[in-house]
Structure formats: C-alpha cells, structure tokens
C-alpha cells in the first residue's frame, strides 16, 4: 500500500526512490551561474539512468543547487535549513499504443508522480507522501492496422505546493512509469525554493 | 530544429516568438495597481490575435507588469535585474472532433506549450527551450452521428519552475497550437516572479 | 529508503509534524489547505491538520482564503479526479471536469476567475482512471480579497493531503 | 572542478595483466554517474571498455571478454582496471572518464600510455 | 555492437567556411525522447573533449560556431566559421546500448 496515495505500478516507494534517485553529486563547489547565494532553491533536470531509471542533473542546461542546498542519488534532495518550501514537479511521459488492438481498458495506463519527505526531524522511518499527480492515458490504435504500434502519446504530470521542511529533511520523486519518462529538454524537472 | 521539443506546426521557435508574442505593449507606466515595487514581477493573460494567433495582455483584468518589468511583442517579457525566477505557465486548449468519423489516429493532436529564453547574455543565437509542457488529446465522436463535429473537448498544459535569469534576458511562450487555444478568463496565462 | 506502507489513518497518527517555528521576521502570509476527506460531496478546506496551515494573517472563512495584506501573492490550487469503468454496454456520456480559483474582491461584484482548467472525460472508454488538475501563478491582492475555489466534479475528487489542497503566499 | 588522473606502469608484458588507477577529485564517486575506461590504439581509433557505475555495478565491452574487471575503492575515491593475458594489441592510450550517460562524457583524464612488449 | 561510421575520413576547409562531419549509426539510437549521441574533439597529445551532448546540445564552454543536428541514425556535426583553434580530429558516440562505441574520426585541416 502507498500511504494514502494514488495506486502505482511501483509498490514499494523507497525501491524506487533507490532507483530514481541516482546520477547525482553534492554540490562541492556552487555552479558558477548561482546568481542567488542567500536563497536555498534547487531545479533538478531528469536525466535517464540506465535500466529505464529516472534520475536527475544538478548542473546541467538549466540544473542549479545554491546556498548549501544538496543532491545525492541515494538520499534526494536536502534543503539546508528549516523553512516554509514552494516545492513543484513535472514529468512528462511519452508512449505508444501497443500491437495488437484489443479493448482499450487493456491500453490505458495510469501515470503519476509523487513527491515524498523523508528522513530528518522527520524520523528515519517510512517516507511521506507530500504532493502528487496522476493521469490516465488510453493510446488510440488503427482499428485497420492491428500489427504495429499506435502512435506516439504525449502527457505531462505536474503539481507544485508549500511545504514546511526542517534542516536534514530530504525529499525526492517516485514514479510510477519510469521506462515511459519523456527526458526531451525543458520535459522533466522538479525543484524547491525558500519562501518564508 | 525545435531544441529536443515535440514536432509542432511552427518548427521556427523564433518565428512562433514573432507570432505568439503579439499584443502588447511596453509599459510607459506602471499600473496603478503595482502593489510590490521592489520585486520583479509579471503576470500575461492571454488574448486573441487577429489570424488565429496567442497574443498576451500585460494590464486588463489580472495582468500586471511590476518594477521595470517589459514586455513586447517583438522581443517577450523581460525581466529587469539578474536573480533567480519562478517562471510558469498554463496555456487551457479546446476543439472538437473533426466531421466524418475515420480512424481515431487522424483526430490525435498533441498540444504543446513551451516557454524559451533568448537574448542578453546568453547571446543573441538561438532561443533555448526552458520548460515544456505536452498533451496528446484524441477527441471522439459519436459513432451514431457521423456528420456533424464531436463534443467540445477541453485541456490544459501547464508548467512552473526556477530559472536563473539574468537582465536583458528576455523569456516567451511557444505553443504548437494557436487556433485551439481557450481564452475564456483564468485559461491562459504565462508569468514570472523574482524569489531571489 | 524504507518503503514500508501505512494505512491513511495510522500515517496520519505517524506523521506528526511540528510546527515551524521560524523568526518572526522571516515569516510571510502563506497558507496550504487540504480537502476535507471526511466531506466527500463537497470540496470543503482545513487548515491546522496534517500538512495544512495557516500563517501570518490569513485566514479561512466561509471556505474562502481571507487576504491579510495588499501585494503579490502566488495563489496555486491542485484536484485530482477519478473513476470507474462504466459496463461495456453502457453509452457512457462524457463526464466534463473542472476547477477554478476565483477572487472575490470589493473592486468586483461578482467572483472573478483568476485560475481555470477543464477536462472532458469519457468513462466508457477507459478502466478506473485519474487525473490531476494544478495550476498557480502570481496575483496583486488586495487586503480583504477572498480567494475560493469551484469544482465541477466533486463526486469524483480523491480526497486527499497529497492530491487536493489549495494554497497562497506573498512574494 | 571534477578531476580525473590515470595512473600506472607504461610497460607490461605479454600475456602478463595490465593494472590501471583512476583517481577522482572534485566529486564522490558513489554520489553518481558512470565511471568508464576507454582507451585509444595507435591508428587513434577509441573504445570503450567499460564502466563502473556509482551504485557499484559493471559493464563491460563483449570483446573483452572475461579479461577485464573494473572495480572502485570509495574511501580512496578511486576506481581500477585490470585486463588479463594482455597481447601488443592492448598496446595505446588508456583514458578514464566520468560518464553522464545521455549528456556524454563530461570529464576526462590526460590519458597514459601503455606498451606491451617483451 | 552499434557501428558508428563517420565520414569524411579527412577535410580540409578555408578559414571562416563551413565544416560539416556526418555520423551514421548502424541502428537507432534514439530513447526517451532524445538522442544519445554526441561529439567530441581531439588536439595531438590531449584527451577527447566533449563538444556536443544529445545530438544537438553546446557543452558548457563549447564556442556557438559548433552545432550538432540529426536523429535516430543520421547525426552531423557543423563547424561555422572554422577557426584556425579547430584543427583536430572530431569523434561520434552513441551511448545508447552498451557497449559504447565510437565513430572512427574525422581529421579537420585548414586549407
């Protein structure tokens, strides 16, 4: 069971945050374009892992950690110090139908993202569902063309809110398709600024 | 070449920028409602352009321009001083199925909306994609009724994220479809804040 | 990380999280509020549960926002909706979704949408299904500006911290 | 800034095997990415040989058969390789790199020279 | 293993005209919505430097006069103006199955 959340593929949320997690550094030295010191923000860019993982890019194109905000590919996302947060997410997903017609119920997939807290003052134990999004798609197919796949699908997931985060406290994406990711430039991202 | 973004009907983002950014003005003065002088902020509502195309109102209804904030048609909205941006938009969509019935593939749009960056100090080339938002919409029909259009169908795409912007930088909206736009009040709106 | 799973209810028992208590001069009006899950044909908002606040002069009243202070504020709200399949041999009609943020304001008469999104679903087409509406962005407000919402499709809300809530906070 | 240096013997023998060390500074190898040997033979064609990736786990290039093992030490902040039975046609430049898998590889090392020969 | 195959072997171009590279990949290396290929430089005695990432992308630092285009199995590489800096040798590379492998070089003189 998801703790109170929307059903996904994945069950275990920290399995997959193993997954989805990697492909990232802490930030020994600030990207040169911080232009921000005094703010804690970070805008992390999906980046895929191998094995059909969703990670994420901290310096990359648009990527960013400023004012002793981290990232490693284990833990998440750590905001360096207690405060209200705008956290946001999005992920866009791309697939198509598969062959073979049928009924359309067996087509449709059910795409989400989460956001989750964990860790902190918060406590060691099981992770936090923050925030969270979902989209059913349902592919359409040729009915005169049964062999090959349908065409390419488009949608993204997003969501963004106010989050009271303490020092320590991490927070980081589940998703439910990562193999369905759409990691094209500007797609995927999710972030965190201070606000109060 | 659109930058890793969807394939659209304006494969041009410059020339979509020219299209898409109409309407507008710079603001001579500021409007009497600007109640936050020292943050740079912008909201842009949507509005027609004559030939079908997404324009932006800088002060009818909710619209505002704050502290040096600009926008042109020409050129987007620029922001005043180098800092770190919430940049977001949500472009709502609407249309109906096509008369005639015909395999459901043909009815498939993907509607995208896309905000770039150009200009100032990232250099006068070409523009680069910032945050993307797609949806792949198959409207229906009614297979009792084959002449006439299908239901009205409605969507939004939406975005949000951080950007580290730097002055004379200027940012604009990209959308695929102009004609399916929905401008009906709170649909259609792109905007920026400083938050650092 | 542990991905041990909780019921709702015990998660809710487990996952008391204390209050900030930030300086004082650091604190802004902000607010983040969650649909009442207990309410489930209504959308109706709590602060001061789970996730939900109230800070530094706003508050909630007759389930509208009360703005505490003239400025920009970023006003952002999230549904989520679903459903079930209907039999094959149902003609199912479209199932039209929908919410808005709207401001009442002493310089308008009438509830202004400042927020829209809408969606056509078709149930017959589809197994149990979901979809998620957010949307948020920056607004002058003026003190004493009452920010609601409306929602067509209430039967369908997945009532939850997580995926309805409703919130602001000044720039 | 991330740094990369290759360090080892420039002369090994025939059917002796080849030990190389990478050393990383600037940034944990366990935080993330791909830890890939790639090396350049004398008509300057490269290949790649294969990677160890910030979870611990190994790839490796087919034609390398069983000869090759990547392996790391985290404290040391270092990652090795070993090719076995090597011929003159091991013979080239040895490179270690950071791979970012869809953004390339970022960060390279100068390269060492390896001869093997009698 | 996916074959990369660059041409031309050699080029020679006049200073402040246009270099063009092409690389074509035995199959697709097209994924997620993005391509993974890229290109890098080499000068004697120095490593590869990555010049391009996902076909199409300027690494940071990486002077505007290159640019990169193409997907799936056609990529090309595009210097405008050459500059006297850019003689070197110029490599694809699919990152997209394992094992990685590379073009086999395009060596850019000046005329």
């Known amino acids: 069971q998801d703790q109170g959340g929307l059903v996904t593929e994945t069950a275990d949320p920290g399995a997959q945050a193993q997954q989805g997690l990697g492909f990232q550094k802490l930030p020994e030295e600030e990207p040169e374009t911080d232009l921000s010191p005094g703010l804690p923000a970070a805008h992390l860019i999906g980046a895929p892992l191998k094995g059909q993982g969703l990670g994420w890019e901290t310096t990359k194109e648009q990527a960013f950690l400023t004012s002793g905000t981290q990232f490693s590919d284990a833990e998440g996302l750590a905001l360096p110090q207690d405060g209200l947060y705008y956290l946001y997410c999005l992920v866009g997903y791309r697939g198509r139908a598969p062959p073979g017609g049928g009924d359309p119920q067996g087509r449709s997939v059910t795409l989400r993202s989460s956001l989750y807290r964990a860790g902190g003052a918060y406590g060691p134990g099981t992770p936090e569902l923050l925030l969270e999004g979902a989209e059913t798609v349902t592919p359409v197919l040729d009915p005169a063309r049964r062999q090959g796949y349908g065409p390419l699908w488009y949608t993204s997931v997003g969501f963004g809110g106010l989050v009271q985060l303490r020092r320590g406290e991490r927070v980081y994406v589940n998703i439910s398709h990562p193999d369905m990711v759409d990691f094209a430039r500007g797609k995927t991202f999710f972030g965190a600024v201070m606000v109060g | 070449q659109d930058q890793g973004g969807l394939v659209t009907e304006t494969a041009d983002p410059g020339a979509q920028a020219q299209q898409g950014l109409g309407f507008q003005k710079l603001p001579e003065e500021e409007p009497e409602t600007d109640l936050s002088p020292g943050l740079p902020a912008a909201h842009l509502i949507g509005a027609p352009l004559k030939g079908q195309g997404l324009g932006w109102e800088t002060t009818k209804e909710q619209a505002f321009l704050t502290s040096g904030t600009q926008f042109s048609d020409a050129e987007g909205l620029a922001l005043p001083q180098d800092g770190l941006y919430y940049l977001y938009c949500l472009v709502g969509y609407r249309g109906r199925a096509p008369p005639g019935g015909g395999d459901p593939q043909g009815r498939s749009v993907t509607l995208r909306s896309s905000l770039y960056r150009a200009g100032g100090a990232y250099g006068p080339g070409t523009p680069e994609l910032l945050l993307e938002g797609a949806e792949t919409v198959t409207p229906v029909l009614d297979p009792a009724r084959r002449q006439g259009y299908g239901p009205l169908w409605y969507t939004s795409v939406g975005f949000g994220g951080l950007v580290q912007l730097r002055r004379g930088e200027r940012v604009y909206v990209n959308i695929s479809h102009p004609d399916m736009v929905d401008f009906a009040r709170g649909k259609t709106f792109f905007g920026a804040v400083m938050v650092g | 990380l542990p991905g041990v799973g909780l019921t709702p209810s015990a998660a809710q028992t487990a996952r008391q999280h204390p209050k900030m208590h930030l300086a004082h001069s650091t604190l802004k009006p902000a607010a983040h509020l969650i649909g009442d899950p207990s309410k489930q044909n209504s959308l109706l908002w709590r602060a001061n549960t789970d996730r939900a606040f109230l800070q530094d002069g706003f508050s909630l009243s007759n389930n509208s926002l009360l703005v505490p202070t003239s400025g920009i504020y970023f006003v952002y709200s999230q549904v989520v909706f679903s459903g079930k399949a209907y039999s094959p041999k149902a003609t199912s009609s479209p199932l039209y979704l929908a919410h808005e943020v709207q401001l009442f304001s002493s310089q308008y008469p009438f509830h202004v949408p400042l927020l829209s999104s809408q969606k056509m679903v078709y149930p017959g087409l589809q197994e149990p299904w979901l979809h998620s509406m957010y949307h948020g962005a920056a607004f002058q407000l003026t003190q004493g500006d009452q920010l609601s919402t409306h929602t067509d499709g209430i039967p369908h809300l997945v009532l939850s911290p997580s995926t309805v809530f409703f919130g602001a906070f000044a720039l | 800034d991330v740094q990369l240096q290759e360090s080892g013997p420039g002369l090994v023998k025939p059917s002796q095997s080849l030990s190389l060390t990478c050393s990383v500074t600037g940034y944990s190898i366990t935080s993330g990415y791909y830890w890939n040997w790639i090396r350049q033979f004398p008509g300057n064609k490269l290949e790649g040989m294969g990677y160890?990736?910030?979870?611990?786990?190994?790839n490796y290039n087919p034609s390398l058969k069983n000869r090759i093992s990547i392996t790391r030490d985290s404290s040391k902040n270092q990652f090795f390789l070993k090719l076995n039975s090597v011929t003159a046609e091991d013979s080239g430049t040895y490179y270690c790199?950071?791979?970012?898998?869809?953004?390339?590889?970022?960060?390279w090392g100068q390269g060492t020279s390896v001869t093997v020969s009698s | 293993d996916i074959v990369l195959t660059q041409s031309p072997a050699s080029l020679a171009v006049s200073l402040g005209q246009r270099a063009t590279i092409s690389c074509r990949a035995s199959?697709?290396?097209?994924?997620?919505?993005?391509?993974?290929m890229h290109w890098y430089q080499q000068k004697p005695g120095q490593p590869p430097k990555l010049l391009i990432y996902?076909?199409?992308n300027l690494e940071s630092g990486i002077p505007a006069r290159f640019s990169g285009s193409g997907s799936r199995t056609d990529f090309t590489l595009t210097i405008n103006p050459v500059e006297t800096d850019d003689v070197a040798t110029f490599y694809c590379q699919q990152s997209n199955k394992d094992p990685y492998t590379f073009g086999g070089g395009t060596k850019l003189e000046i005329k």
């Open positions: 199959e697709s290396v097209d994924n997620y919505g993005i391509s993974f």
């Open positions: 790199a950071r791979d970012a898998y869809s953004y390339g590889m970022d960060y």
């Open positions: 996902r076909a199409s």
């Open positions: 160890i990736s910030y979870d611990g786990s190994n």
